[in-house]
């Protein structure tokens, strides 16, 4: 019986060009976490395996950093990074738990300020 629950940071926002930490936490179960997969909608971003450690998908290597812990750090954010992110916890003996995070990447306030008050 699966008794665990995934707690996530929920809906979060960050500025374009900045960084954000995606975090999930599995609680209320004694199941062993064997692997955590991080996905962005339909793309595999990274995997953290209890034995093999981290694998970051090559296409994201420049902008994705492992950790802290089982979390994932996204760097040099662009507006295209806006969307759903999923942490998929593979556990034994429970099975799979999935958490969802929605990230909105906003134009930086500095950029907006500069655009609005430019001197011709």
């Amino acid at each position: 019986m699966m008794t665990g629950t995934i707690e996530t940071t929920g809906n979060i926002s960050a500025e374009k060009g900045g960084s954000i930490i995606l975090q999930c936490h599995l609680s209320s179960t004694t199941a062993q976490v064997t692997q955590v997969n991080w996905e962005q909608q339909d793309q595999l971003l990274a995997i953290c395996n209890a034995d093999l450690g981290w694998h970051i998908s090559p296409s994201f290597k420049d902008r994705v950093a492992p950790g802290p812990g089982l979390g994932l750090t996204l760097q040099s954010l662009t507006v295209n990074d806006t969307g759903e992110y999923f942490c998929i916890y593979h556990t034994y003996p429970d099975g799979t738990y999935t958490g969802r995070i929605f990230l909105e990447v906003l134009e930086s306030s500095v950029a907006e300020h500069g655009a609005r008050f430019q001197i011709p």
Partner: antibody
Framework: EVQLLESGGGLVQPGGSLRLSCAAS????????MHWVRQAPGKGLEWVAA????????YYADSVKGRFTISRDNSKNTLYLQMNSLRAEDTAVYYC???????????WGQGTLVTVSS | DIQMTQSPSSLSASVGDRVTITCRAS??????LNWYQQKPGKAPKLLIY???SLQSGVPSRFSGSGSGTDFTLTISSLQPEDFATYYC?????????FGGGTKVEIK
Amino acid sequence: EVQLLESGGGLVQPGGSLRLSCAASGFTFSSYSMHWVRQAPGKGLEWVAAIKGNTGSTYYADSVKGRFTISRDNSKNTLYLQMNSLRAEDTAVYYCARVPYGVWMDYWGQGTLVTVSS
Amino acid sequence: DIQMTQSPSSLSASVGDRVTITCRASQSISSYLNWYQQKPGKAPKLLIYAASSLQSGVPSRFSGSGSGTDFTLTISSLQPEDFATYYCQQSYSTPLTFGGGTKVEIK
């Protein structure tokens, strides 16, 4: 260098049994999921079974469930496939494969031929 | 079970040609899609994993794309050693399933 070497194939009568082995070297065997995949003569690839490295959890194709058993001996760096109640349709080359993160099969053995015929 | 449909089942091409093979999953598999090359009498060889990641040691003329249900393997400039059979495979859920294969032959 990663190496996988299958053995144990051969000719067996319908209803008979056979045990395949896959000897692994060049990597930390216990850390990896291992799978068996087969290929009937002139046909495509068919996944047969898998066993996880860290938990020993096993998974089977419906076509072999209840007849085949996958197991591993991490102290011997060896993967096994016990095949019982063999049928003519089990005739194939059987490959073992290493599967990092349970996602892709990055190294394969050379295969061992199992022929089920009377 | 997730069905993998590969097309075409065979194709004839010349050295230097650009070749595209497609694979369609019966349901969304995110990017859990791998491509393998197999030559007669040999074991399959991993080319592309997780839809678009090039396996170490594989020439850059091979590339993969797609997500969800539709995927593509492209060989940008076919070489003599590329004449073989290519398979896609999903690892989204068990049972793992392969496409039927695409045989690339010399024109």
